[in-house]
Interface confidence: medium
C-alpha cells in the first residue's frame, strides 16, 4: 500500500512484497526490500527511531536508493505497519505484517507493565483499548474489573480489530478501575497487558478574564492578562490566545493549575499573558479560549493603549441638574483620560470635602438635597502625570414643593367676631414659585368633628365637599386679593389673601398651592362667634421678659361668668389640617387662670396679665362666657406667641474694597435679633458721623460714601447691638489715586 500524495517528479517507493497485509509465522525471518528514486528510510512497529538491535537495515548491493529491512526470528510483538519513505517527504509505501504467535497473540506495548485509557462519561463517545493482535482473526473479549464484567463484540458498537484494538462505548467501562483483552486459542486463554481506566471530564463552567474590562495602558507599560477557566474534575485544559500583535517579542505565556479547596467539585486553570512594554499595535481585542477537547469556551476584553497622558470630559457630562428637596442627587464626572484623573469638586469656588451629607468622588453625591445646595458646581480633572487640568461647571437647581408658612401654627384656631371683616392669609414658599394658589371653603356644620365620626390622620375631615370661593352661596361673602410677593426671612414668598367681608357663618377655608414639583395646602378653621372678644395689649407679639395683657370683653346684658383658661400642654392629638374638638365641649383640657374684672357702662372686661412673659407662656388662651338666658357656654380662643430673645447677628460679610478717588462706595449691613438691634458705623474705631458725603439710610443699614477722598480710606466697622450684646463686621476700604487740588488750595 502506498501513502502520501504523488509528486510530479517522484514515484512511490516500491516494496519487494507487493501486498497490503502479510501473515508469517513466529521464528521465521522477515525480509523486505524497498527501491526508489532518492534517499530512503524505514519505520517499523514499537521502535519508530531505528535503534532496535534485532532489526537490520542494509543498503542493497545491486543499486542506488535501495534498502533492505531484515528481522530474524520474528515474534508476535513485531506485528504492525512497516513503512518505507523518502526522507523529508510524505511519499511512503506501507505493508502490515502479522506475526502469528499463538503463545502471545497480543502485541505488548513498549512499557510492558500497563497502559492507560482515558474516557469521558459521554453516552455518545467510544473508547479504544489498544490491545493489538498478532493474529487478525482472534476471538477477543474485554474484561473490566471490579466488579468483573466481560464484554464481547456485538457487531455494532463493541468490536475488536487487530490493527486498532477493542472499541467499546466509554460509559460501559467508566465504573472500572482497569481493563484487559482476552483471547481464546485452543481452549487456552491469553491476556493483554492491563489498562488503567482514567475517567476524564470535559465540562468548562466558565472562562474569566482579569482585568475584565476598561484596560488602559500607555506605550511602554506592562500588560498582564489572567485567564481563569473553571472546570469539572478530571479535566485537562488547553489555552489559546488571540491578540492584535501576534509577533510580539516581549510576550510571555504561563499556564498553571490553581489549587482548589479539598472536597471541591471544581478545578481551576490559569493562563497569564504578559507583554512587557506595550506599543500602539498592541491595542485591540484579546481573546482567551480554553479547550478541554470536547468543549471550548472563550472570553474577550479590549485593551486600549495611549500614546501620551490626556484628560477630557465625556460627551455625557451634564451642565444642568434639577432636583427636588430631599432627593439624592448624583452628578457623575464623566471623563476620558489616562491615567484616571484626580477629581476635585468645588461649589461656588469653595472645595468640597466628603462628609455624611455629601460624597465628593468620581460621582458627586448629595444624600438629601436641600435648597442651600443650589449653585454652580465645578469639577476639575487633573491628569496625574501631565498635570493637565480640565474644568466643567454643573448648575444644580433644587426645587421646593409649596410650603405654607402658617401651616406650622397648628392650634385650636382663633374665633372671629360676628359681622367683622377678616383677612385669611397663606404665605407660600416654593421653587419655582407656585403657578397657582386656589382657595376653597365648606360650612363648619357640614364637617363637624363629632366624636362618633371616625377621623383618620390621612383624611381628617369626614366630608370633603370643598367648594370654590367663587361660589360663596350660603357662606360668607369673599374676595380673593391678587397675590403679593414679599421677601420674608430672606426668601421670596408668595402671599395670597382671602378677605371675608362679613363674618356671618362658621366655615372651613383651604388654600392650595401648586408648582411643578408638588402641592401644599392649609386648612383654616373660621369659627364665628357672637360671644366675647379677645384683644391683646399691647397689640403685638410680645418678646420674652416683656409684659402682655389678654383682655376678654363681653356684653354685660348678654353674658355672665367670664373666666380665663389656658389650653393644657397635651390636648387631644391634632393632626396637620385636622379640626380640633371644640374647646367648650372639652373643659378637661383647660387650666383655670387668675384674672381681674373691670366693667364699663355696657361691657365686662376680664384681664389676664402676664408679667415678664416667657416661652412657657406661649399657647392657646380661652375666654369662656355663659349666656344669661340660655346658659349656653361661649368660648373664644386666642393663640399667644412669645418671641424668643436672640442676640444680634449680622448676615453677610463686608468685603474689603479698593475705590478710586471721586467714586462712590455703597455697603449694607443687615442685622437680625430680638429685640431688634441698633446699627452703628465706625471708621478706624471712631463713630462715623453723617455729613454731606456720608449718608446712612434704612435704620443705618446702608452706608453710602459719596465722592470718596483719600481720608475716607480706613477700617470700617458695622456694629449691631441690643440688650443681649453686639455683633460686628469689618472691612478695609482702600482709596486709590491722587487727590485733586481744589481752588481753595
Amino acid at each position: 500500500a502506498s501513502v502520501g500524495l504523488p509528486s510530479v517528479s517522484l514515484d512511490l517507493p516500491r516494496l519487494s512484497i507487493q501486498k497490503d497485509i502479510l501473515t508469517i509465522k513466529a521464528n521465521t525471518t522477515l525480509q523486505i526490500t524497498c527501491r526508489g528514486q532518492r534517499d530512503l528510510d524505514w519505520l517499523w512497529p514499537n521502535n519508530q527511531s531505528g535503534s532496535e538491535q534485532r532489526v537490520e537495515v542494509t543498503e542493497c548491493s545491486d543499486g542506488l536508493f535501495c534498502k533492505t529491512l531484515t528481522i530474524p526470528k520474528v515474534i508476535g510483538n513485531d506485528t504492525g505497519a512497516y513503512k518505507c519513505f523518502y526522507r523529508e517527504t510524505d511519499l511512503a509505501s506501507v505493508i502490515y505484517v502479522y506475526v502469528q504467535d499463538y503463545r502471545s497473540p497480543f502485541i505488548a506495548s513498549v512499557s510492558d507493565q500497563h497502559g492507560v485509557v482515558y474516557i469521558t462519561e459521554n453516552k455518545n463517545k467510544t473508547v479504544v483499548i489498544p490491545c493489538l493482535g498478532s493474529i487478525s482473526n482472534l476471538n477477543v473479549s474485554l474484561c473490566a474489573r471490579y466488579p468483573e464484567k466481560r464484554f464481547v463484540p456485538d457487531g455494532n458498537r463493541i468490536s475488536w480489530d487487530s490493527k486498532k484494538g477493542f472499541t467499546i462505548p466509554s460509559y460501559m467501562i467508566s465504573y472500572a478501575g482497569m481493563v484487559f483483552c482476552e483471547a481464546k486459542i485452543n481452549d487456552e486463554s491469553y491476556q493483554s497487558i492491563m489498562y488503567i481506566v482514567v475517567v476524564v471530564g470535559y465540562r468548562i463552567y466558565d472562562v474569566v478574564l482579569s482585568p475584565s474590562h476598561g484596560i488602559e495602558l500607555s506605550v511602554g507599560e506592562k500588560l498582564v492578562l489572567n485567564c481563569t477557566a473553571r472546570t469539572e474534575l478530571n479535566v485537562g485544559i488547553d489555552f489559546n490566545w488571540e491578540y492584535p500583535s501576534s509577533k510580539h517579542q516581549h510576550k510571555k505565556l504561563v499556564n498553571r493549575d490553581l489549587k482548589t479547596q479539598s472536597g471541591s467539585e471544581m478545578k481551576k486553570f490559569l493562563s497569564t499573558l504578559t507583554i512587557d512594554g506595550v506599543t500602539r499595535s498592541d491595542q485591540g481585542l484579546y481573546t482567551c479560549a480554553a479547550s478541554s477537547g470536547l468543549m471550548t469556551k472563550k472570553n474577550s476584553t479590549f485593551v486600549r493603549v495611549h500614546e501620551k497622558p490626556f484628560v477630557a470630559f465625556g460627551s455625557g457630562m451634564e451642565s444642568l441638574v434639577e432636583a427636588t428637596v430631599g432627593e439624592r442627587v448624583r452628578i457623575p464626572a464623566k471623563y476620558l483620560g489616562y491615567p484616571p484623573p484626580e477629581i476635585k469638586w468645588y461649589k461656588n469656588g469653595i472645595p468640597l470635602e466628603s462628609n455624611h451629607t455629601i460624597k465628593a468622588g468620581h460621582v458627586l453625591t448629595i444624600m438629601e438635597v436641600s435648597e442651600r445646595d443650589t449653585g454652580n458646581y465645578t469639577v476639575i480633572l487633573t491628569n496625574p502625570i501631565s498635570k493637565e487640568k480640565q474644568s466643567h461647571v454643573v448648575s444644580l437647581v433644587v426645587y421646593v414643593p409649596p410650603q405654607i408658612g402658617e401651616k406650622s401654627l397648628i392650634s385650636p384656631v382663633d374665633s372671629y367676631q360676628y359681622g367683622t371683616t377678616q383677612t385669611l392669609t397663606c404665605t407660600v414658599y416654593a421653587i419655582p414659585p407656585p403657578h397657582h394658589i386656589h382657595w376653597y371653603w365648606q360650612l363648619e356644620e357640614e364637617c363637624a368633628n363629632e366624636p362618633s365620626q371616625a377621623v383618620s390622620v390621612t383624611n381628617p375631615y369626614p366630608c370633603e365637599e370643598w367648594r370654590s370661593v367663587e361660589d360663596f352661596q350660603g357662606g360668607n361673602k369673599i374676595e380673593v386679593n391678587k397675590n403679593q410677593f414679599a421677601l420674608i426671612e430672606g426668601k421670596n414668598k408668595t402671599v395670597s389673601t382671602l378677605v371675608i367681608q362679613a363674618a356671618n357663618v362658621s366655615a372651613l377655608y383651604k388654600c392650595e398651592a401648586v408648582n411643578k414639583v408638588g402641592r401644599g395646602e392649609r386648612v383654616i378653621s373660621f369659627h364665628v362667634t357672637r360671644g366675647p372678644e379677645i384683644t391683646l395689649q399691647p397689640d403685638m407679639q410680645p418678646t420674652e421678659q416683656e409684659s402682655v395683657s389678654l383682655w376678654c370683653t363681653a356684653d354685660r346684658s348678654t353674658f355672665e361668668n367670664l373666666t380665663w383658661y389656658k389650653l393644657g400642654p397635651q390636648p387631644l392629638p391634632i393632626h396637620v389640617g385636622e379640626l380640633p374638638t371644640p374647646v367648650c365641649k372639652n373643659l378637661d383640657t383647660l387650666w383655670k387662670l387668675n384674672a381681674t374684672m373691670f366693667s364699663n357702662s355696657t361691657n365686662d372686661i376680664l384681664i389676664m396679665e402676664l408679667k415678664n412673659a416667657s416661652l412657657q407662656d406661649q399657647g392657646d388662651y380661652v375666654c369662656l362666657a355663659q349666656d344669661r338666658k340660655t346658659k349656653k357656654r361661649h368660648c373664644v380662643v386666642r393663640q399667644l406667641t412669645v418671641l424668643e430673645r436672640v442676640a444680634p447677628t449680622i448676615t453677610g460679610n463686608l468685603e474689603n474694597q479698593t475705590t478710586s478717588i471721586g467714586e462712590s462706595i455703597e455697603v449694607s449691613c443687615t442685622a437680625s435679633g430680638n429685640p431688634p438691634p441698633q446699627i452703628m458705623w465706625f471708621k478706624d474705631n471712631e463713630t462715623l458721623v453723617e455729613d454731606s458725603g456720608i449718608v446712612l439710610k434704612d435704620g443705618n443699614r446702608n452706608l453710602t460714601i459719596r465722592r470718596v477722598r483719600k481720608e475716607d480710606e480706613g477700617l470700617y466697622t458695622c456694629q449691631a447691638c441690643s440688650v443681649l450684646g453686639c455683633a460686628k463686621v469689618e472691612a478695609f476700604f482702600i482709596i486709590e489715586g491722587a487727590q485733586e487740588k481744589t481752588n481753595l488750595e
Partner: antibody, heavy 126, light 110 residues
Framework: QMQLVQSGAEVKKPGSSVKVSCEAS????????ISWVRQAPGQGLEWMGR????????NYAQTFQGRVTITADKSTSTMFMELSSLRSEDTAVYYC???????????????????WGQGTMVTVSS | QPVLTQPPSASGTPGQRVTIFCSGS????????VNWYHHLPGTAPKLLIY???QRPSGVPDRFSGSKSGTSASLAISGLQSADEADYYC???????????FGGGTKLTVL
C-alpha cells in the same frame, strides 16, 4: 521596592556642561515621572524639571529653561540631567526623585516625591 | 526666591508641639495638594506628609498636616531631639507648570 541610583560626584569648570545619571532598579519604569531637584550650599530645595520616561516628554523650571536637558533611556531605565553653561552658583547636590502614582481615597491621586536618589555633588570651580 | 513662604526657623523643647506654616497662592496650594519633606544634611530628603494630611507608612502619627485655602501647616507633637532637621513644603503650580518648594524651616529642639 524601586531604587534610584545616581552617578558619582563631578568637578567642572565654569562654562562647561555636566551630565548626571539616575538609574531605576527593582521596579517598573512605567509611567512615573522623574524630577530633578537641587540644593546649593546653605540654600533650600529647588525643582529643575521632570521627565515622563514612558512618553519621553520633559518640562523645566523657568529658571533653568534653555540650560537644562532631561532625557530618559527606556532600554536601561536610566534618566539623565544635563546642565550647560555652568557657573559657580550651580555648585550643589543634585537629586533625582520619583513622583509616586498611587491612588488613595478613590478620587485623589497621591502626588509626591516618594523615592529619592542618594544625590550627586557637582562642584563648579575654575 | 522660593514661591512658597516658610519661616526660616522654628524651635521647641522636647515633648512640646510645634507648627510650621507654609503660604502660597491659588495656582499652587489653592488648587493642588501639599506635601512635606524632612531633610537631614548629607542625606536625601524624605517624604513626611502627602496629599495635605496623609502619612506614608513608617511616619509616626506625631506628624500631621492640614491645608486651608492657600496655606498649609505641619504640626509635630511630642517633640523629640531626633526631629531636628530642615522641613520643606511643596506643591504643584498650575501657572508655572512645575513643582514649587518652600524655602525650608530649620527646626531646633532646645
Amino acid at each position: 521596592q524601586m531604587q534610584l541610583v545616581q552617578s558619582g560626584a563631578e568637578v567642572k569648570k565654569p562654562g562647561s556642561s555636566v551630565k548626571v545619571s539616575c538609574e531605576a532598579s527593582g521596579g517598573t519604569f512605567s509611567s512615573f515621572a522623574i524630577s530633578w531637584v537641587r540644593q546649593a550650599p546653605g540654600q533650600g530645595l529647588e525643582w529643575m524639571g521632570r521627565v515622563i520616561p514612558v512618553f519621553g516628554t520633559a518640562n523645566y523650571a523657568q529658571t533653568f529653561q534653555g540650560r537644562v536637558t532631561i532625557t530618559a533611556d527606556k532600554s536601561t531605565s536610566t534618566m539623565f540631567m544635563e546642565l550647560s553653561s555652568l557657573r559657580s552658583e550651580d555648585t550643589a547636590v543634585y537629586y533625582c526623585a520619583r513622583e509616586s502614582g498611587d491612588y488613595y481615597d478613590g478620587s485623589r491621586y497621591v502626588d509626591a516625591f516618594d523615592i529619592w536618589g542618594q544625590g550627586t555633588m557637582v562642584t563648579v570651580s575654575s | 526666591q522660593p514661591v512658597l513662604t516658610q519661616p526660616p526657623s522654628a524651635s521647641g523643647t522636647p515633648g512640646q508641639r510645634v507648627t510650621i506654616f507654609c503660604s502660597g497662592s491659588t495656582s499652587n496650594i489653592g488648587s493642588n495638594t501639599v506635601n512635606w519633606y524632612h531633610h537631614l544634611p548629607g542625606t536625601a530628603p524624605k517624604l513626611l506628609i502627602y496629599s495635605n494630611n496623609q502619612r506614608p507608612s513608617g511616619v509616626p502619627d506625631r506628624f500631621s498636616g492640614s491645608k486651608s485655602g492657600t496655606s498649609a501647616s505641619l504640626a509635630i507633637s511630642g517633640l523629640q531631639s531626633a526631629d531636628e532637621a530642615d522641613y520643606y513644603c511643596a506643591a504643584w503650580d498650575d501657572n508655572l507648570n512645575g513643582w514649587v518648594f518652600g524655602g525650608g524651616t530649620k527646626l531646633t529642639v532646645l
